[in-house]
Structures are given as C-alpha cells and as structure tokens.
Interface confidence: medium
C-alpha cells in the first residue's frame, strides 16, 4: 500500500493517515517540538514527492503504545 | 474559464434520494478533489465529504456516513452527490467545490448551488 | 455547534478597519491550514486566504490573514459597502473523525 514511488494527496492523504495513526488522530504539520526545521508538512514529503509507512507515522498525533 | 455547474432544484419526500450533479469545465477534472458543503437556510457552511475523481475514493463526514455517496464520470468531467433517506433537515443549499490536492490551498471555485428542498 | 468559533456578528462604518477572529484547538487550527471564505448574499462562498495568509489572485490586499497557535484572524482594512457578507474560516481537524471543518460564520455589517 505505501510502495516506492507513491504518492498521497489531498483527501486519500487524509485517508491514509487516519488509517495509519488510528484512533491517535494526527497532524499536517508536525508540532514546532518534533519539526524539521527544513520540513514544512506531510504534503511536501508525501504529495510532492513519494514517502513511507513510517514517515507517515511520525505525523501521529500521540505515538504508539508499545506492546 | 474555469466552473463548476450544478444541476437544477430539486422537491423530494421525506424518505427519497436526490442525486446532484456538478460538470467541471476549464481545468483537468481529475488534478482536483472535489468537496460538496451544505447550507441550510439562514445557517451556515457544514462540509459533507470529497472524492478524488482520478481514483474515486471518498471520505465523508462522520454525520452523513452511511446516507451519502459520491460518485463521479470522468468522461463528462461531473461529479455527483447523492443523498438518501431524505428528512426534513436535510433542506439546503447544496455546493460543490474543487480543492487542489494540496489541500491548504483551499476549495478556490465553486459551483452555483442546488437548492434541495424535502417536503410532504 | 462548530468546531471553529467565530463572532456572530460585527460592524464598521466604511473606510474603517474590521477583524474577525476565528478559535479552535491543537487538532485544527494549530497544526493545520486555515482558509477564509467571503460569502455576498445569494451568493455561492469565495476563496479570499488560504494557508492561513496567502491571497487567490484577484483578491486585494485590503484582506488579510493571520494565525497565532489555536486562533486565526481575518482583517479588512479600507471597509466598503461591498464587503458586506458573511465570511467562515475553515481548516481540517485531524482529531479522530478527520474532516474539514467550518467555522458557524461572521455577518460583517458596513455602517451608514
């Protein structure tokens, strides 16, 4: 589903996140404490150019409970 | 130029469907999400969901989840919004609007508006 | 209720200076994009910010827009009687039920 060379955007970027972030809901833009200063949001890393399960997940809101 | 054309008003019974259509012109009809937001006489604007017409795919509103569905014909570049089991608060003006898939440039046109009225 | 809170309603005679405020949270506002809608009476609503301060082309720069961590703010300097409407922000909420979000709208009144 997150495959090299994909993109998300718009509405499926939504989509994609509430998926993926469940019930943590989430953020386009990371809070300033965990921002890349270079990052500007998800859109750029994942709608302008292709991105992964796991920088998707560092979008979450609230990080996953480990087991 | 660049529209978004709705179909005419609508009078349905409480219990019915109605179906809205929304034919874009002047612009590539799938490099845009389409929206479609309500608006109740004398309220204001309350979002119902998107569909992406490249793929299809739709994500509604919690509160329409189950009544609505969004569908759309590329090859005639409209959109359509259709609406079931019908009541009374349903009635509204009905918009489309497009939204680029970078979605913080905002929904930059809009259609003219369906008025939907359901009445026994 | 909406999830956005704005004003029901202000005034100001022409020429003068208006701001409307717009409250939300963490899962909106904050960490989203706000658009601002400008809607004439009968009328269809139109595009007048996006990403929080950036105006359509077409727009003049008598419009504004502003965000400040859970609040955004739309100011119009130079007031005209044509700029009577009812004007709405609106951005996502990224909380559990994603969507757009709408603010329940500002009735700006030009005096006289």
């Known amino acids: 589903a997150y495959g090299p060379g994909e993109t998300l955007c718009g509405g499926e970027l939504v989509d994609t996140l509430q998926f993926v972030c469940s019930d943590r809901g989430f953020y386009f833009s990371r809070p300033s404490s965990r921002a890349n200063r270079r990052s500007r949001g998800i859109v750029e890393e994942c709608c302008f150019r292709s991105c992964d399960l796991a920088l998707l997940e560092t979008y979450c809101a609230t990080p996953a409970k480990s087991e | 130029q660049v529209q978004l054309v709705q179909s005419g008003a609508e009078v349905k019974k409480p219990g019915a469907s109605v179906k809205v259509s929304c034919k874009a012109s002047?612009?590539?009809?799938?490099?845009?999400?389409i929206n479609w937001v309500r608006q109740a006489t004398g309220q204001g604007l309350e979002w119902m969901g998107w569909?992406?017409?490249?793929?299809?795919?739709?994500g509604y509103a919690q509160k329409f989840q189950g009544r609505v569905t969004m569908t759309r014909n590329t090859s005639i570049s409209t959109a359509y919004m259709e609406l079931s089991s019908l009541r009374s608060e349903d009635t509204a003006v009905y918009y489309c609007a497009r939204d680029p898939y970078y979605y913080y440039y905002g929904m930059d046109v809009w259609g003219q508006g369906t008025t939907v009225t359901v009445s026994s | 209720q909406s999830v956005l809170t704005q004003p029901p309603s202000v005034s100001a005679a022409p020429g003068q200076k208006v701001t409307i405020s717009c409250s939300g949270s963490?899962?909106?506002?904050?960490?989203?994009?706000v658009s601002w809608y400008q809607q004439l009476p009968g009328t269809a609503p139109k595009l007048l910010i996006y990403?929080?301060?950036k105006r359509p082309s077409g727009i003049p720069d008598r419009f504004s827009g502003s965000k400040s961590g859970t609040s955004a703010t739309l100011g119009i300097t130079g007031l005209q009687t044509g700029d009577e409407a009812d004007y709405y922000c609106e951005t996502w909420d990224t909380s559990l039920s994603a969507g757009r979000v709408f603010g329940g709208g500002t009735k700006l009144t030009v005096l006289g």
């Open positions: 569909m992406n017409p490249n793929s299809g795919n739709t």
């Open positions: 990403d929080n301060n």
């Open positions: 002047g612009y590539t009809f799938t490099s845009y999400d």
């Open positions: 963490s899962s909106n506002i904050e960490n989203n994009h």
